[in-house]
Interface confidence: low
């Protein structure tokens, strides 16, 4: 028997991936555990092997289909179970009725690029990845810029309250190296959370023209 508190959290990327983390105090050692996904009204079911990510937590990704296939909808419900092997049998450690569109976490934005850079401003664009067409334009973004001598945690957040896949950064310092990140979140879903931050995009502002005031 396993004692201690168990926490089982999963998110749907809105297309064909459910990512799960299971943590268990008084953790199981050297035990094989899986997440089983059983949709209530779909022909398929899926399993993934939980792999350790820390002393007492495991993670895995349920791959439901090709990355851009729409495998679930807002009225689907998926029974997710954590099953761990005990000798010759499997024991259920956790269960949840998973509502995919109430538990969304999209993939990080991709294809960040500098569209135009000047001395004091920079226009940056990006793309969303594997996001459902169901959202239409109901997405929001957060962005942050890393300035020299600061950490990401200190960077102020800029919020874009609409589906806008570009930003114009203003009041930058000339001839300075910056990094930029963006993340996305659907407006739908009680337990929906922000995507991971995108890979940082490094850029440098243009130097000020000689003899001119900056």
């Amino acid at each position: 028997a396993v004692n201690g508190t168990s926490r089982f959290t999963c998110f749907y990327n809105s297309r064909a991936n459910i990512s799960c983390v299971w943590s268990q105090d008084g953790a199981l050692q050297d035990t094989s555990c899986q997440v089983h996904a059983w949709p209530d009204r779909r022909r398929w079911n899926q399993t993934c092997e939980l792999l350790p990510v820390s002393q007492a937590s495991w993670a895995c990704n349920l791959i439901l289909g090709t990355p851009d296939s729409q495998k679930l909808t807002a009225v689907d419900i998926v029974t997710l179970r954590v099953m761990c092997r005990e000798g010759v049998r499997w024991r259920m450690m956790a269960i949840q009725d998973f509502k995919p569109f109430e538990n969304l976490r999209l993939m990080a934005p991709i294809s960040l690029q500098v569209v135009h850079v000047e001395t004091h401003r920079c226009n940056i664009s990006w793309k969303i990845s594997q996001a459902s067409h169901y959202f239409e334009r109901h997405l929001e973004f957060e962005a942050r810029t890393l300035s020299p001598g600061h950490t990401w945690e200190e960077a102020p957040l800029m919020t874009l309250k609409q589906k806008q896949e570009w930003i114009c950064l203003e009041t930058l310092t000339p001839d300075t190296q910056y990094e930029f990140q963006v993340r996305v979140k659907p407006l739908q879903g009680e337990f929906t959370t922000w995507s991971p931050w995108s890979q940082p995009l490094a850029f440098r502002t243009k130097p000020a023209a000689l003899g001119k005031d900056t």
Partner: antibody
Framework: EVQLLESGGGLVQPGGSLRLSCAAS????????VHWIRQAPGKGLEWLGV???????DYNAAFISRLTISKDNSKNTVYFQMNSLRAEDTAVYYC?????????????WGQGTLVTVSS | DIQMTQSPSSLSASVGDRVTITCQAS?????LYWYQQRPGKAPRLLIY???NLASGVPSRFSGSGSGTSYTFTISSLQPEDIATYYC?????????FGQGTKVEIK
């Protein structure tokens, strides 16, 4: 063979409560959601709510304040409770289950149980 | 809520006739079902996911459509087809049914 059998219908006083049972056989209620649908005399079908395999529920918002769906996995039985009944709740109440295939609708129905709300 | 409007509400046709019922949704739906209900009986699933025939259902029944407009057809009406037919959406909660179409034999 999948079967659903409702029971608990009958005459209920206005303002009273109703508790119906849906005994499932041929499948486990830990693997499938069970829905409740009703039909007033001479009228159409109205979806009331569902209890999913893991025990969570979805209700028709029009009934959420007076409806509770629960289940006893050990008895493989689902329960339907509605409070503050009025004459317009008079109906045949069905439990139903979706089939196995992709989005295949209510493939299995109980025979229904008649509830009459009257003084 | 999504309103499902069936037409006609009733019809009378001869044995062997082709019968068509339409179902209009108040907004676009992804998954549509058709049920047959004979008097005093529980509904029976005929068509799932717009156009797929449920198990054991004769091939004279068919369904088609997309978005907000759907059609149910009986290619050759038989005496045992006397019943009320309902459409139903399973795209958003609450799940909703059409008001029904009563089919009678002339």
């Amino acid at each position: 063979e999948v079967q659903l059998l409702e029971s608990g219908g009958g005459l209920v006083q206005p303002g009273g409560s109703l508790r119906l049972s849906c005994a499932a056989s041929g499948f486990s209620v830990t693997s499938y959601g069970v829905h409740w649908i009703r039909q007033a005399p001479g009228k159409g079908l109205e979806w009331l709510g569902v209890i999913w395999s893991g025990g969570s529920t979805d209700y028709n918002a029009a009934f959420i304040s007076r409806l509770t769906i629960s289940k006893d996995n050990s008895k493989n039985t689902v329960y339907f409770q509605m409070n503050s009944l009025r004459a317009e709740d008079t109906a045949v109440y069905y439990c139903a289950r979706a089939g196995d295939a992709n989005y295949d609708g209510f493939a299995y129905w109980g025979q229904g149980t008649l509830v009459t709300v009257s003084s | 809520d999504i309103q499902m409007t069936q037409s006609p509400s009733s019809l009378s046709a001869s044995v062997g006739d082709r019968v068509t019922i339409t179902c209009q949704a108040s907004q676009s739906v992804s998954f549509l079902y058709w049920y047959q209900q004979r008097p005093g009986k529980a509904p029976r699933l005929l068509i799932y996911d717009t156009s797929n025939l449920a198990s054991g259902v004769p091939s004279r029944f068919s369904g088609s459509g997309s978005g907000t407009s759907y059609t149910f057809t009986i290619s050759s009406l038989q005496p045992e087809d006397i019943a009320t037919y309902y459409c139903q959406q399973w795209s958003t909660y609450p799940l909703t049914f059409g008001q029904g179409t009563k089919v009678e034999i002339k």
